[in-house]
Structures are given as C-alpha cells and as structure tokens.
Amino acid sequence: CKAMHVAQPAVVLASSRGIASFVCEYASPGKATEVRVTVLRQADSQVTEVCAATYMMGNELTFLDDSICTGTSSGNQVNLTIQGLRAMDTGLYICKVELMYPPPYYLGIGNGTQIYVIDPEPCPDSDF
C-alpha cells in the first residue's frame, strides 16, 4: 500500500435544499485505470461511510441507485454532490481515494470538508 495526497476544501455550506458539493483532487503517481472513491463522515469521534463508487478513468462515477451521492470525474478530480442533508448531518466529510488498478495499490485520505447544514425557519413550503 502506497500513500497518495488527496486535497479537498476545508469548508462547504449546504444549500437550502440540503445539497452540498465539493471537489476531491488526488495526486496520481501513475496511470490508474480503476479508481474507488469513498466519502466518510466523522462526527462525535465516529466515522461512518456515506457512499462509495468505483469508476474507470474517463467514465462516469456510478453510485448505487439509492445513494445520497452523485459525482463526476475529470482527470484526477472528482466532483462530489451529497443531497438530502439536514442540520443533524453537519460534520466532517472525508474523501478517500484508492487507485485499484493497475498495481501498485495507492491509498489517499483527505483532511476532510466540514459541511454545515442549516435548518430553515418556518416559511411556505421551504425545503427542510
């Protein structure tokens, strides 16, 4: 297992519709063809997996149908979007990137993006 640098923004504010987007960029040491991206959430010293996708370079990221994440890739950048967020989902969202193929295997973990989600106050049919 070899280490790899992963960069992501420090802070992101979710929209009023509970959508947060951020870029996860990795410094690929070689010509990887298969990449796995995992989003982890750290809150109250607990780390949980939010979503994960494996993709072939040049192709779209494919998350599970019921995933709260969507994403696109461009070179060594992955544009991640998380939806359905509410105030209780505020936390540190960590981007983990694995270069699966060809060998050698590389692993990179970002410092995390603090996503803030604010519950709106009552107003006609606002998004919560």
């Epitope: 359905g84 989902d89 519950d119």
Partner: antibody
C-alpha cells in the same frame, strides 16, 4: 426498546386549541427529527411538520402555517404539537414519527410511530 | 407543490398474486421515497425507504424500485395479512408529502 408514547384523546370545541404530546424513550432524543402526521377518519395520511429536537427549529406544511406550533422539552424527551383555531375538519388521529439524519448508518426515516391521538372537534 | 400520484387507488387481488403499486412524483426526487402499509385500525408501518431499502423485519415479498419520478412497490406473493392501504411518501425535504393511498383487498 424505542417507544413514542402520545397523550390521550381530546375533544375540543371549534375555535379552541389542542396540544398533543409525544414522549420518546429508548434512543437519544436529540439525534432524530420528529414529524407530525395526521389522518382524518377514512382519509389518507397528511404531513403537518417537522421539528429538530436538538436545536428546536421547525418547519410546517403550508396548509398549517400560522395555526401549528411544534416545540420540544429535552429534559423530558417530549415533543409537542399545538394546533389552534380548530375546525370540524381538524378531527383526526395525530401521529408523531421519528426520522434520523440521512447519514446515520442503518437509519430508516419514519421507522417508529406513536400510537396516535384522536382529536375530535365538535360543538 | 410537489404532487405524488398513486395508482391504482384501489385493487382487488387473490392470495399468491403478484401485486404492483406505482407512485409518480411531479418532479425528480432521486431515490428519496418511502412506502408504508397501514392495516385497518393500525398505525402506518414503514416497508421500504429510499426507494429500495427493506425496513428491518419486513417480509421479503415486498420490494421497491425506481428513481427520479417513477417508483414501484411490488408484493411478489400476496398474503391475507397484506390487506391494507399502501402509501408512498417523498422524504427528500419539506414538505414530506404522501400519496393519496392505494387500498388493497383480497378477492
């Protein structure tokens, strides 16, 4: 085990207010949202609003704006739904239901419901 | 407002039949849709959440599918205890609207 226990049946006159309680136990009260849903006799389910027991913020269906207030008491793990200006069409069973954050592992929305509180509005 | 339209509004089927209920949403809600069963006189019971996830303890004959605006609840082999009204509900954000319900009876 998780339980949501609601207050008993109420009979109110038109124009009056009613306050229904929902006491939670068996889980961390402030870690789940709470919704209120009502069901008129022989009718479908109608979402009324949601409250965040942690911060106390709430959001209501447009239909109930100005008439409904949702509050919570963290010391007793209880949420309240108060509906004012009662009319006969407010006669219904009122339910509370919990809802976890989307990122909670193995968390399913609306997985536990209260037993329901029948509110009858009659002169 | 986002509208949820269930079809059919009522149906009658025989024990062992495969039953399908659909829920059409007026705008894209990704996979944020729940399905409930409410037996006569009972509290609503969560069957499926986020389109296709089984709630713990729900019989495997129930399944859900769909994404975007079109969703389906399927009962692979109808049982007598499935006599109930079934509701879909959007859970993406407020308002957490319910469909009007589908009343299922046994022939």
């Amino acid at each position: 085990q998780v339980q949501l226990v609601q207050s008993g049946a109420e009979v109110q006159k038109p124009g009056a207010s009613v306050k229904v309680s929902c006491k939670a136990s068996g889980y961390t009260f402030t870690s789940y949202y709470m919704h209120w849903v009502r069901q008129a006799p022989g009718q479908g389910l109608e979402w009324m609003g949601i409250i965040n027991p942690s911060g106390g913020s709430s959001n209501y269906a447009q239909k109930f704006l100005g008439r409904v207030t949702m509050t919570r008491d963290t010391s007793t793990s209880t949420v309240y739904m108060e509906l004012s200006g009662l009319r006969s069409e407010d006669t219904a069973v009122y339910y509370c239901a919990r809802d976890p954050p989307i990122t909670m592992v193995r968390g399913a929305p609306f997985d536990y419901w209260g037993q329901g509180t029948l509110v009858t509005v009659s002169s | 407002d986002i509208q949820l339209t269930q079809s059919p509004s009522s149906l009658s089927a025989s024990v062992g039949d495969r039953v399908t209920i659909t829920c059409r949403v007026s705008q894209d809600i990704s996979s944020f849709l729940n399905w409930y069963r409410q037996k006569p006189g009972d509290v609503p019971e969560l069957l499926i959440y986020r389109s296709s996830n089984f709630q713990s303890g729900v019989p495997s004959r129930f399944s859900g599918s769909g994404s975007g605006t079109d969703f389906t609840l399927t009962i692979s082999s109808l049982q007598p205890e499935d006599v109930a009204t079934y509701y879909c509900q959007r859970t993406y954000n407020a308002p957490y609207t319910f469909g009007q319900g589908t009343k299922l009876e046994i022939k």
